[in-house]
Interface confidence: low
């Protein structure tokens, strides 16, 4: 009866430089022995080498010398007693490209190289980019752990070195930015800025990086109202604090623009004397049109800002003066109110 030696392994595998790959493999060999049980040794060799003299790339035989260039990077995974010959290749290098074969040895009777089922390994340039993980969106003032990892990398070979760059990192200790993980407490000004994680394999010229744009949610800030006078000279008044009085001539047309800085954008609404103004008068952008103002249409105008991280409001008093002339003029500023605009 012919002895049966079989090997199941894929013909070819491709891996990017610096990354790792697991090649599944199983084998069978003839073994019948009731009186002795010598150890089972298995080997992976580089093709073209003579098994008896060659250094192996991976083995479970402690007495066999392993190639220094594959030591620790090529490893047998799984239980060889269960006929598992799976090979793990870590920190792949361009010079690893080539053909490999598997060999089994047990006692004097079993010595066999599976030359018909070679594994062809191709190492290509690194195009994989690291992954940057964090819970989104970031919230201003709340510490968030960010982690950078290179998919397909594993612990074999020299360690990966990480470096983070970006404006948001300026308050951090430079040492902190050289770890695969960092804790960032984002600020409003960090919204929209870039954060880059660069990964390099120590001792190798293999570098890859990924850049993400930070989406930082932050509470409303810099709330302001600008008043534009339609038939004026394009002048705008800017109101930054509550309670300011703005005198205006009856018949004037105004645009009130409420602006605020927040992320996500806040919703803006206008109120007059505490009552919400008709949506048809206002726009989504927080602009309110007041055409041809009548004597009774003055009062306290309030822009209210609503946002998941906090609400604010800003008010001013529109004091409508009865018309006595049709000129467009600006009187001198008096007693803490704005000039009279006619």
């Amino acid at each position: 009866e012919k002895p049966v030696y079989e090997l199941q392994v894929q013909k070819s595998v491709t891996v990017q430089e610096g990354l790792c790959v697991l090649v599944p493999c199983s084998f069978s060999y003839p073994w019948r022995s009731w009186y002795s049980s010598p150890p089972l040794y298995v080997y992976w060799f580089r093709d073209g080498e003579i098994p008896y003299y060659a250094e192996v790339v991976a083995t479970n035989n402690p007495d066999r010398r392993v190639k220094p260039e594959t030591q620790g990077r090529f490893r047998l995974l799984g239980d060889v007693q269960k006929k598992n010959c799976s090979l793990s290749i870590g920190d792949a290098r361009m010079e690893d490209t080539g053909s490999y074969f598997f060999r089994v040895e047990r006692g004097r009777d079993v010595k066999y190289s599976y030359q018909q089922n070679k594994l062809n390994l191709e190492v290509t340039a690194l195009i994989e980019k690291p992954d940057i993980h964090f819970l989104e969106p970031l919230e201003s003032g709340r510490p968030t752990r960010l982690s950078c990892s290179l998919p397909g990398s594993c612990e074999a070979g020299p360690p990966l070195t990480f470096s983070w760059t970006g404006n948001a990192l300026s308050p951090l200790d430079p040492e902190t930015t050289r770890s695969s993980e960092l804790t960032l407490t984002p600020r409003p000004e960090d919204h929209g800025t870039n954060l880059t994680c660069q990964v390099k394999r120590q001792g190798a010229q293999v570098t890859t990086e990924r850049t993400v744009q930070l989406n930082v949610s932050y509470a409303p800030q810099n709330l302001a109202i600008s008043i534009f006078f339609r038939n004026g000279t394009g002048t705008a008044l800017r109101i930054l604090s509550n309670g300011m009085s703005v005198p205006i001539q009856e018949g004037q047309s105004l645009f009130l623009a409420c602006t605020v800085d927040s992320n996500p954008p806040a919703s803006l609404s206008w109120f007059r004397e505490g009552k919400a103004l008709n949506p048809s008068q206002t726009s989504m952008s927080g602009t309110l049109e007041l055409p041809n103002i009548g004597a009774r249409e003055g009062g306290e105008f309030t822009c209210r800002v609503q946002h998941p991280l906090g609400s604010q409001h800003l008010s001013f008093i529109l004091s409508v003066q009865r018309s006595s002339s049709s000129c467009i003029c600006v009187t001198e500023k008096q007693q803490g109110s704005w000039p009279l605009l006619t």
Partner: antibody, heavy 119, light 112 residues
Framework: QVQLQQSGAELVKPGASVKLSCKAS????????IHWVKQRSGQGLEWIGW????????KYNEKFKDKATLTADKSSSTVYMELSRLTSEDSAVYFC????????????WGQGTTLTVSS | DVLMTQTPLSLLVSLGDQASISCRSS???????????LEWYLQKPGQSPKLLIY???IRFSGVPDRFSGSGSGTDFTLKISRVEAEDLGVYYC?????????FGGGTKLEIK
């Protein structure tokens, strides 16, 4: 096992300052946030702020911003809270508590430090 | 600040009965990352508080399954299905979604 050991009870005069300590053991100090919580006699709990030893990040409850100062000594895995310009309102039990970054809550607490402010 | 209002202030229950504590927040406590950081703590007399529930409904390790949390948005509930003697103490709800983080006023559970 995880432990947060707080310093002993303090009796101090109004206007003075005091520094309470919270020594962590049984886990990697830099991987968890330490929080401080105030409890006045027979009353509820008030969050004071956090200190994250991993990055030195600090966040205060605005109410305690001018009252409490949080610091840490990584070499001894200890977080400190200094309370200044003490008044009788500061008399309370102060707890430190550990929180996992993933939002699991305050999973371990110190035994509390009783602060009495009295002339 | 987010105000956490607990009801009732105190609860008198017989051993084996069910107890229910309500906690209402003055605004939504859904964090911008989508999580709701609502927790429940029990403080027994003379002890530090202990974590029971986090993220609304997840029981902390070692907490008996008679404790359950539920709710969303602004309304949350802690239920104890069969009250035991060791459950007495003050229960606090807590939100960790918006700074400053805030506790509820507490609910005192007493045994009849």
């Amino acid at each position: 096992q995880v432990q947060l050991q707080q310093s002993g009870a303090e009796l101090v005069k109004p206007g003075a300052s005091v520094k309470l300590s919270c020594k962590a053991s049984g886990y990697t100090f830099t991987e968890y946030t330490i929080h401080w919580v105030k409890q006045r006699s027979g009353q509820g709990l008030e969050w004071i702020g956090w200190f994250y030893p991993g990055s030195g990040s600090i966040k205060y409850n605005e109410k305690f911003k001018d009252k409490a100062t949080l610091t840490a000594d990584k070499s001894s895995s200890t977080v400190y809270m200094e309370l200044s310009r003490l008044t009788s309102e500061d008399s309370a039990v102060y707890f430190c508590a550990r929180q996992e970054e993933g939002g699991i809550g305050f999973d371990y607490w110190g035994q509390g430090t009783t602060l009495t402010v009295s002339s | 600040d987010v105000l956490m209002t607990q009801t009732p202030l105190s609860l008198l229950v017989s051993l084996g009965d069910q107890a229910s504590i309500s906690c209402r927040s003055s605004q939504s406590i859904v964090h911008s990352n989508g999580n709701t950081y609502l927790e429940w703590y029990l403080q027994k007399p003379g002890q530090s508080p202990k974590l029971l529930i986090y993220k609304v409904s997840i029981r902390f390790s070692g907490v008996p399954d008679r404790f359950s949390g539920s709710g969303s948005g602004t309304d949350f509930t802690l239920k104890i299905s069969r009250v035991e003697a060791e459950d007495l103490g003050v229960y606090y709800c807590f939100q960790g979604s918006h700074v400053p983080w805030t506790f509820g006023g507490g609910t005192k559970l007493e045994i009849k």
